[in-house]
């Protein structure tokens, strides 16, 4: 998987008037990393792991850059002509990636009221837009503004691409959190369902990276997809992830069911606890 840095900026307008605040979130390798609050931007590390990336540094540079980007986006929103009354949002998502072969990718995407209307490959400078007439109108509007604005020249976009990669490389150099492997803690719980049935849930938490296999097996054979319910793999706020899988089984058959977990080449099997013990925790080495 490539290393990535993702900026998500959002600005709002109310009845055609652009609001002064904005929200910026930065994700590093898919994890919430920095955040700027709406009213006054102050880059805040999201959890201890983000602070560990660059130690006790001040985030002045990030704050300055993110504030500048927020101002640019507010100006862009002000130039969108078809703003109706009520609340509207303009979102810019900028992503840069460094792949294992050292190749890079950078892109920028604009969303109006949550709908994608314009994308740019920051390396090839190629623009793309969805087919809908609304998206096309918005895209023309924004592209014309960006062309007019001296700040938004090709040089500027090259700089955006270069700056993003430069920041990403700087964060990677710290080497504290990235390309690490944190094994999951797996715990199996049971709860009474309907007459004669119980629901068994297998939870994996605190793991990194996010790729994980979690499934229920009966006598060593995987249950079919439609007999299991899966939770999304979500960040848990500590620079790691969590997820779960559940299924319904007959009471008395618990010993035949196991939760199978595979993560970063390691695997483990977790039985259903007996009726008296509600939680069984296990941690593979």
């Amino acid at each position: 998987e490539p290393h990535s840095l993702r900026y998500n900026l959002t600005v709002l307008s109310w009845d055609g008037s652009v609001q002064s605040g904005f929200l910026t979130e930065v994700h590093l390798d898919g994890q919430p990393f920095l955040r700027c609050d709406r009213q006054k931007c102050r880059a805040k590390p999201q959890g201890q792991w983000a602070e560990d990336v660059l130690g006790n540094k001040t985030w002045d540079r990030e704050t300055r850059d993110l504030t500048g980007n927020g101002k640019d986006l507010r100006m862009t929103l002000a130039h969108i002509k078809d703003q109706k009354e009520g609340l509207h949002s303009l979102q810019e998502i900028r992503v840069c990636e460094i792949h294992e072969d050292n190749s890079t990718r950078s892109s920028q995407h604009f969303y109006y009221d949550g709908e994608l209307f314009l994308s740019q490959n920051l390396e090839t400078k190629e623009w793309t837009m969805p087919q809908s007439s609304r998206a096309q109108t918005l895209a023309m509007n924004v592209r014309n503004f960006l062309k007019e604005d001296a700040m938004k020249t090709k040089t500027h976009y090259h700089a955006m691409h270069a700056d993003c990669l430069q920041e990403l490389r700087r964060y990677l150099k710290s080497g504290v959190v990235l390309r690490r492997t944190v094994p999951p803690m797996v715990n199996v719980t049971r709860s009474e369902a309907s007459e004669g049935n119980i629901t068994v849930t297998c939870r994996a938490s605190g793991f990194y990276p996010w790729n994980i296999t979690l499934s229920w097996r009966q006598d060593g054979v995987s249950l079919s997809h439609d007999t299991q319910q899966w939770g999304d793999v979500l960040p848990d706020g500590n620079g790691t992830y969590q997820t779960w899988v559940a299924t319904r089984i007959c009471q008395g058959e618990e010993q035949r069911f196991t939760c199978y977990m595979e993560h970063s080449g390691n695997h483990s099997t977790h039985p259903v606890p007996s009726g008296k013990v509600l939680v069984l925790q296990s941690h593979w080495q």
Partner: antibody
């Protein structure tokens, strides 16, 4: 005595149908997941289909998907394999096999029937 | 689908020999591997589950090892009744058998 007895095999023309049965005795059939496994003359074992104890999970080998249907009747202690659109390459001895319930099992088949021969030929 | 490759496809051995049969999976299957013995005209017999656990009633001269992609079945001292065909089977992803290894008398 724990036993599985297959029946329903025979000679059938290509494109034809057959229904195999497997009668279980000597154990609580409803607790066990079951399989059909076949063996072409002079060849190795080929897994065909799996059905869990409650029939909620069913799997088929790619070679029979869409043509064969596995089912079970726990009240009758019976396993079935409905075979449609039969081909020459379906010619084989068909075994039913029980999945063991030993702790730490990995989908192993502990009890097998004696097999029933299915010949597809014009 | 996961392919299971057994080697050798056949071997000749004498009573008392130590025999090793290997089974390789096309991708990691953890320890979801079982071994069977089959004699001509008979149904297969279950020997080993979870790569290395001996089924009750199976002689201790049979043993299994391995995990991931490479597995072995070992017969420490071949007996006359051990001349047969041996199959591995995985249940990691659905179910598949290896092609078999025929153990013949030298």
């Amino acid at each position: 005595e724990v036993q599985l007895v297959e029946s329903g095999g025979g000679l059938v023309q290509p494109g034809g149908s057959l229904r195999l049965s497997c009668a279980a005795s000597g154990f609580t059939f409803s607790r066990y997941s079951m399989n059909w496994v076949r063996q072409a003359p002079g060849k190795g074992l080929e897994w065909v289909s799996y059905i869990s104890s409650s029939s909620s999970t069913i799997y088929y080998a790619d070679s029979v998907k869409g043509r064969f249907t596995i089912s079970r009747d726990n009240a009758k202690n019976s396993l079935y394999l409905q075979m449609n659109s039969l081909r020459d390459e379906d010619t084989a001895v068909y075994y039913c096999a029980r999945v063991s319930v030993i702790t730490g099992n990995t989908g192993a088949f502990d009890i097998w029937g004696q097999g029933t021969m299915v010949t597809v030929s014009s | 689908d996961i392919q299971m490759t057994q080697s050798p496809s056949s071997l000749s051995a004498s009573v008392g020999d130590r025999v090793t049969i290997t089974c390789r999976a096309s991708q990691s299957i953890s320890s979801y591997l079982n071994w069977y013995q089959q004699k001509p005209g008979k149904a297969p017999k279950f020997l080993i589950y979870a790569a290395s656990s001996l089924q009750s009633g199976v002689p201790s001269r049979f043993s299994g090892s391995g995990s991931g992609t490479d597995f072995t079945l070992t017969i420490s001292s071949l007996q006359p009744e051990d001349f047969a065909t041996y199959y591995c089977q995985q249940s990691y992803s659905i179910l598949t058998f290896g092609g078999g290894t025929k153990v013949e008398i030298k």
